[in-house]
């Protein structure tokens, strides 16, 4: 090789100038005896090359781009050849931000999955290969005195979310969780969280059912619904609250909140709505008095209250 | 410390019936669903029964049902169980014992031996 | 109604030894599964619950692991005190059911 760059840094802070140099060794004897070394930035030619040779007969050529602008580039340094440029030697340039501290950390125990799932925002784009690692360990207190650490949970790649399963979680004992994000340029830790697993359990929904009318039993009034639900079974010895929500199937009313109902409610009647009409409803439930996350809406149960009786 | 004592065992005839009875202390028990678990002579665990918390939720081991009743009295911090119609299958330590929340047992109480027999 | 097989039913063992029990429901409970100690005449006693998480106050020798239909327990160095009977439970959904039990005596 005739050429060799060198650079100041590969990876720089966008805009920030970047000092590079090119050597051209003596033993490339076909080159003339003052060859004027050329600088291209992808496909521009700059300017401002100071050039001169080297003790031992090398030729160099050093520049300083002011503000490197471009993300991502290419600098070679190169020889006319003819009519003709030829390259001698190039570097790839990056330049982008340190990363932001990563923000809005939440977690949420899935008990289906066996895993506590915690996501967050990344923050600017970076420009740069950012790694993320979800850091945890074990605490007997309130976080502040670590415990045993737990192994680093990487997500996928572009994935702002990680899981970490069932062996290295205590469902009631504090665990410290926080995200760090690293490039070439730098690492930033977002604010540490301190939760049990168990307080941030976020369950499934009841099912909703109509409610078999028995024999003994009054029809429904006019512009009542008669409910039942069935929990979620692996849930059942939580403690829990609900809230049932219901709106017309025709227009465009919105939804209205009925709640809280206590889970083991398991049959209710929901009144005080238009007779003769087609109602959309869903249920949704959340651990309580202890803490935890709202489940999903339960998926759909549609009814049709009964008609008003004539006078 | 939590502590659960069971009384109300003893022998009783087929057909006969019993109540056992779960006194509780030093926790919250309004708060925490219970259960009642059973154990023949030389056998294994069986479960007979839970409540939920506010006692509204009751179900029941196939072999027991229409036949024993669980209730509760959280005033009383006391947990039930009216046995009726009772067999000679039925003879076992009855253990009453608090559900943690995915349902597990803990603690128990030292149990009470119902025994069936003519 | 979901099954629980208990393997084995007995086993002879001597203190220091490791030692594994299983488990095994007839469908998938997640991690709905709970461990127990129990020696005569005494009531049963939490060892692990929801699979793997270690009760309050009980050795860390004592430990479990699986998920969906197998699981195991295992006593690392089994200790004089260990020798008891084992039981397995399932609290994915009612019935509640219970494993036949290992009964862990002195070889």
């Known amino acids: 090789e005739c050429g060799h760059i060198s650079v100041s840094a590969p990876i720089v802070h966008l805009g920030d100038p970047i000092t590079a140099s090119c050597i051209i060794k003596q033993n490339c004897s076909h080159l003339d005896l003052e060859p004027q070394i050329l600088w291209r930035l992808g496909a521009e030619l700059q300017p401002g090359g100071r050039q001169q040779r080297l003790s031992d007969g090398s030729q160099q050529s050093t520049i300083t781009l002011p503000h490197l602008n471009h993300t991502r580039a290419f600098l070679s340094c190169a020889l006319n050849w003819g009519n003709s440029l030829q390259i001698l030697d190039q570097v790839e340039l990056r330049a982008g931000y340190p990363p932001a501290v990563p923000r809005n950390l939440s977690c949420l125990m899935n008990l289906t999955t066996s895993s506590l799932i915690c996501q967050w925002e990344p923050g600017p784009e970076t420009h740069l290969p950012t790694s993320f690692t979800l850091k945890s360990f074990k605490s007997r207190g309130n976080c502040q005195t670590q415990g045993d650490s737990i192994m680093d949970c990487v997500p996928e790649d572009g994935q702002s979310h990680c899981s970490i399963p069932r062996r290295h979680l205590l469902l009631y004992q504090n665990m410290g969780i926080w995200v760090q994000a690293e490039n070439a340029l730098g690492t930033s830790m977002s604010p540490q969280l301190c939760l049990e697993p168990m307080d941030v359990v976020k369950l499934e929904p009841p099912m909703l059912r109509t409610m078999d009318p028995s024999p003994e039993a009054a029809p429904p009034q006019a512009g009542c619904l008669q409910l039942s639900w069935e929990p979620w079974q692996p849930a059942l010895h939580i403690n829990q609250k609900c809230e049932l929500r219901h709106k017309p199937q025709s227009g465009e009313a919105s939804w209205a909140l009925v709640g809280p109902l206590p889970l083991e409610a398991l049959r209710y009647e929901l009144c005080g709505l238009l007779p003769a009409t087609a109602y959309t409803l869903q249920i949704r439930c959340i651990r309580w008095p202890l803490p935890g996350h709202w489940s999903n809406w339960s998926p759909s149960l549609e009814l049709r209250t009964t008609e008003r009786a004539p006078t | 410390e939590v502590q659960l004592l069971e009384s109300g065992g003893g022998l009783v005839q087929p057909g006969g019936s019993l109540r056992l009875s779960c006194a509780a202390s030093g926790f919250t028990f309004s708060l925490y669903w219970m259960g009642w678990v059973r154990q023949a002579p030389g056998k294994g665990l069986e479960w007979v029964s839970s409540i939920s918390s506010s006692g509204g939720v009751t179900p029941y081991a196939d072999s027991v049902k229409g036949r024993f009743t669980i209730s509760r009295d959280n005033s009383k911090n006391t947990l039930y169980l009216q046995m009726n119609s009772l067999r000679a299958e039925d003879t076992a330590v009855y253990y009453c014992?608090?559900?943690?929340?995915?349902?597990?047992?803990?603690?128990w109480g030292q149990g009470t031996l119902v025994t069936v027999s003519s | 109604d979901i099954q629980m097989t208990q393997s084995p039913s007995a086993l002879s063992a001597s203190v220091g030894d490791r030692v594994t029990i299983t488990c095994r429901a007839s469908?998938?409970?997640?991690?709905?599964l709970n461990w127990y100690q129990q020696k005569p005449g005494k009531a049963p006693k939490l060892l692990i619950y929801y699979a793997s998480n270690l009760q309050n106050g009980i050795p860390s020798r004592f430990s479990g692991s699986g998920s969906g239909t197998d699981f195991t327990l295992t006593i690392s160095s089994l200790q004089p005190e260990d020798f008891a009977t084992y039981h397995c439970?399932?609290?994915?959904?009612?019935?509640?059911?219970f494993g036949g039990g290992t009964n862990v005596e002195i070889r």
């Open positions: 014992a608090m559900l943690g929340e995915l349902g597990w047992f803990d603690p």
């Open positions: 439970q399932q609290s994915y959904s009612t019935p509640l059911t």
């Open positions: 469908q998938g409970i997640s991690s709905y």
